[in-house]
Structure formats: structure tokens, C-alpha cells
């Protein structure tokens, strides 16, 4: 029972994690314009892995895709690759784990096969989670580096007369979604690996013992019967309440009700 619960929970946690990785990969807010200690602009910039967006204070938002491969920074390409690898591995892991679930019976699949599949999906989830965490962390590191570089050259004077304020970018919501999602996928994978150990059939060989009774020759062979949780095990209906994760497109919507500018 504990094995089934661990496997089921691992599957659900990984499923949520992979959904989060997909959401983070698609989100536009990987980096958002830094508002702290900056002149107040009526334009808010934010960037994702696939496009950059500008939201004017009027509410008008314009997004432009990065319609180039060669012109993009290698780091951005690496982050994209890591996230996609994470999604692909996670998706395959989910597919494998569905068939590995103890509560699902497919033909006459052996417990050992289910155990192997559970381990395989667990490893896939772990690698998927690590890919997502690595991708998000590489991007975050890139942001931190650029942030301090742009702070150092924040005002590039033209003959001391005209000042050009450089737009600085800070962590966007997608980074936090990615970190959490990657962590969940990783935890789910570990849980699947733990469940695999409980699923593997123990090789307990009982020697057949013959009892010679008077008159009859009856051989009792104690069969290796196992207590198994049946298909119709008494599992209560559980409702999973999704907290309704929303993508914050309003990140900048000007902080307080009354601003003096």
C-alpha cells in the first residue's frame, strides 16, 4: 500500500512539476525591467526565451519574437535546449510511469517490469528536473552578470550633455516557476525511485518439504503467496484542488495607488 502511495504521489508531483516546466518555458517573463532605483518610465520591458515584450502604461502590449537563431546569445540557446530536453524527458517519463503505476494493470505485466519502468521514469524525472533547474539557474546567472555590468555603465554620457539610461533587467516570474517546477519534478523522480525498490519482487525461494503420512503420500509445497493490494483496493476518492496558478502579466502595474513622479 505504501509503495502504491509513494509511486502515485511521485507521479502526481512529477506531473505538476513538468506542467510547471512547460509553463515556465512558454512564459514571457524570464527577465523583467528593474524598477528599483531607476527613473520612472511609462514603458515596461520584459523578456522570455522566445520573445520580448513591451507594455506601455496605457496597457498596450507589443511582443516580438526572436526571429533568428544565429544572432541569439549562446547562453540563451543553451537555456532553451536545457528546458526543451527537460520537457521531452519529463514527457517520456510520464508516459513510462503511467504504464508502471501499480494501480493500472496491463495484460500480464510482471512486477519486475513495473519496477524497471518505475525506476526508468524516476531517473527521467530526476534528469528532467535537473535540466530545468540548470536552465533557470544559467539564465539567472546571466541576468545577475548583465545587471551589474549595466549598473556599472548605467549612465553613458555623450559629451556629458545627454544621458542614456540603460534598461536593467531582474528576475522574472518564470524563473521562480521554473525553479519550483524543477524541484517538484526532481522530488517526484526520487519518490518513483524509492517506490521502485518496494515494487521489485523479493526472490524468496522456499524448498519443497515432503511429509510422509501413514497411508497417503501428500506433498505440501508452501507457495510463495504474497499479500498484494488488489485492483479494487479501498482507496478513498481524493480531490486535488489546483490553486489556479496565474501568469502575472501585470508585473509592473504601477505599485501603489498614488504615485508621485
Amino acid at each position: 500500500m505504501a509503495v502504491t502511495a509513494c509511486q502515485g504521489l511521485g507521479f502526481v508531483v512529477s506531473l505538476i512539476g513538468i506542467a510547471g516546466i512547460i509553463a515556465a518555458t512558454c512564459m514571457d517573463q524570464w527577465s523583467t525591467q528593474d524598477l528599483y532605483n531607476n527613473p520612472v518610465t511609462a514603458v515596461f520591458n520584459y523578456q522570455g526565451l522566445w520573445r520580448s515584450c513591451v507594455r506601455e502604461s496605457s496597457g498596450f502590449t507589443e511582443c516580438r519574437g526572436y526571429f533568428t537563431l544565429l544572432g541569439l546569445p549562446a547562453m540563451l540557446q543553451a537555456v532553451r535546449a536545457l528546458m526543451i530536453v527537460g520537457i521531452v524527458l519529463g514527457a517520456i517519463g510520464l508516459l513510462v510511469s503511467i504504464f508502471a503505476l501499480k494501480c493500472i494493470r496491463i495484460g500480464s505485466m510482471e512486477d519486475s517490469a513495473k519496477a524497471n519502468m518505475t525506476l526508468t521514469s524516476g531517473i527521467m524525472f530526476i534528469v528532467s528536473g535537473l535540466c530545468a533547474i540548470a536552465g533557470v539557474s544559467v539564465f539567472a546567472n546571466m541576468l545577475v552578470t548583465n545587471f551589474w555590468m549595466s549598473t556599472a555603465n548605467m549612465y553613458t554620457g555623450m559629451g556629458g550633455m545627454v544621458q542614456t539610461v540603460q534598461t536593467r533587467y531582474t528576475f522574472g516570474a518564470a524563473l521562480f516557476v521554473g525553479w519550483v517546477a524543477g524541484g517538484l519534478t526532481l522530488i517526484g523522480g526520487v519518490m518513483m525511485c524509492i517506490a521502485c525498490r518496494g515494487l521489485a519482487p523479493e526472490e524468496t525461494n522456499y524448498k519443497a518439504v515432503s511429509y510422509h503420512a501413514s497411508g497417503h503420500s501428500v506433498a505440501y509445497k508452501p507457495g510463495g503467496f504474497k499479500a498484494s493490494t488488489g485492483f479494487g483496493s479501498n482507496t478513498k476518492n481524493k480531490k486535488i484542488y489546483d490553486g489556479g496558478a496565474r501568469t502575472e502579466d501585470e508585473v509592473q502595474s504601477y505599485p501603489s495607488k498614488h504615485d508621485y513622479v
Epitope: A42, S57, Q166, T167
Partner: antibody
Framework: QVQLQQSGAELMKPGASVKLPCKAS????????IEWLKQRPRHGLEWIGE????????KYNVKFKDKATFTADTSSNTAYMQLNSLTTEDSAIYYC????????????WGQGTTLTVSS | DIVMTQSPSSLTVTAGEKVTMSCKSS????????????LTWYQQKPGQPPKRLIY???TRESGVPDRFTGSGSGTDFTLTISSVQAEDLAVYYC?????????FGSGTKLEIK
């Protein structure tokens, strides 16, 4: 079509307060920023601030922090600007304008209210 | 605050002539995110409120005659009227709509001979 109606003229005494209306027709105020501007002959145009109807978000030019207060009544589709402690320096034409959906600039303007502060 | 400097303060031309007026800002109005400059040109005729002619430095407002052209980027901007008409008699203002508080130039008064 979009129109912003303002009262024609106001004559006030120094130290008094005045509430200038800006009634929108042809569109719903909610979701648009209403801008308030001041124009004096030798001072050009000055931006006082803006109010986003529906959200209650307000931005004031720090120069007018203690002078202007913005309010709105969505039921009558009207925005208001109250000017306190009037002085002769407040004598000007006050415009309300709507911030357009593109470019952060003002696509429709009221005809303006001429405020005269005189004892 | 951003300072907007317009020149000349006034100019007198004959109908049909080409006119250019300049506007400079103390800081760049170019947004790196979309490579647009947040500068607007307004026309104010006597006794009327200002009317938007050009936004994003070069995008003409619908209904504005194509003799009006805005150009420039960053800190230097120009409004050109290719062939001045009698009805163009007005004061032309440029406005920073990138930084708060929004600021206006002192205006260029166009007079027709």
C-alpha cells in the same frame, strides 16, 4: 465619437478650492488613463498627473503634489480634479485628455476650463 | 525631469514652402525593448486644445495629412511639413512620453506670410 466635456470658465478667490469636471462621452472611462494638464501663456504645457479609472491608480507630478487631487465617478463617466488653496499662479487653462492605447500620448482632449483666480 | 528644447521658437513662411522644426530631449527617449522613441508632436491652433499629430516619433495619427512627417530617434527629433498650408498656422509642441513626469517643449510658433 469620443468627446471630453469640460466646464467653460471658473472665477475663484485666492485661498478657495475648485473642482473641475471632465465628462467623457462616446466611450467608457474605465480602462483608460485621464490626464490633466495646465497651460499658461508664458509657461507652455505642464502635465499635472493622471488617473486610471476602474483601478484607482493615480500618478501626480510631484510639482502639483499638494495642489491637485484626482477623483472619478464611473457611474456618470466623469473625472474630476480638485485644486486647493488657490493663488493667482493657478490662473490658467486646464485640460483633461485621454491617454491613447498606443504611444503613451494623448489622443483626445477636452476644450479646456479657463480658471481665473482673482480677489 | 526631462527637459525638452524646441527650436526655433517661431518661424514665418509662405504657403507651399517646406518647414522643419527641431526638438531635443535631455535624455534618450528610445526604449531598447522595441526600439521606439517615445516622443509625440502636437499641433495647437489658436483658441483650441492641442491635437496629436505624430507619436512614437514618426507614426502619423490617422486623419493627419501626409505632409506632416516626424523623424529622429533617441534625443534629436524633427517635425517636417513638406508644403505648408494656411491652415497649418499653429504652435507645435513636442512631448516626452517615456519618462514621468511627462514634459513638453516650449513650442514652435508657425506663422504664414
Amino acid at each position: 465619437q469620443v468627446q471630453l466635456q469640460q466646464s467653460g470658465a471658473e472665477l475663484m478667490k485666492p485661498g478657495a478650492s475648485v473642482k473641475l469636471p471632465c465628462k467623457a462621452s462616446g466611450y467608457t472611462l474605465t480602462g483608460y488613463w485621464i490626464e490633466w494638464l495646465k497651460q499658461r501663456p508664458r509657461h507652455g504645457l505642464e502635465w499635472i498627473g493622471e488617473i486610471l479609472l476602474g483601478s484607482g491608480s493615480i500618478k501626480y507630478n510631484v510639482k502639483f503634489k499638494d495642489k491637485a487631487t484626482f477623483t472619478a465617478d464611473t457611474s456618470s463617466n466623469t473625472a474630476y480634479m480638485q485644486l486647493n488653496s488657490l493663488t493667482t499662479e493657478d490662473s490658467a487653462i486646464y485640460y483633461c485628455a485621454r491617454k491613447g492605447l498606443r504611444g503613451n500620448s494623448f489622443d483626445y482632449w477636452g476644450q479646456g476650463t479657463t480658471l481665473t483666480v482673482s480677489s | 525631469d526631462i527637459v525638452m528644447t524646441q527650436s526655433p521658437s517661431s518661424l514665418t513662411v509662405t504657403a507651399g514652402e517646406k518647414v522643419t522644426m527641431s526638438c531635443k530631449s535631455s535624455q534618450s527617449l528610445l526604449n531598447s525593448g522595441n526600439q521606439k522613441s517615445y516622443l509625440t508632436w502636437y499641433q495647437q491652433k489658436p483658441g483650441q486644445p492641442p491635437k496629436r499629430l505624430i507619436y512614437w516619433a514618426s507614426t502619423r495619427e490617422s486623419g493627419v495629412p501626409d505632409r506632416f512627417t516626424g523623424s529622429g530617434s533617441g534625443t534629436d527629433f524633427t517635425l517636417t511639413i513638406s508644403s505648408v498650408q494656411a491652415e497649418d498656422l499653429a504652435v507645435y509642441y513636442c512631448q516626452n512620453d517615456y519618462y514621468y513626469p511627462f514634459t513638453f517643449g516650449s513650442g514652435t510658433k508657425l506663422e504664414i506670410k
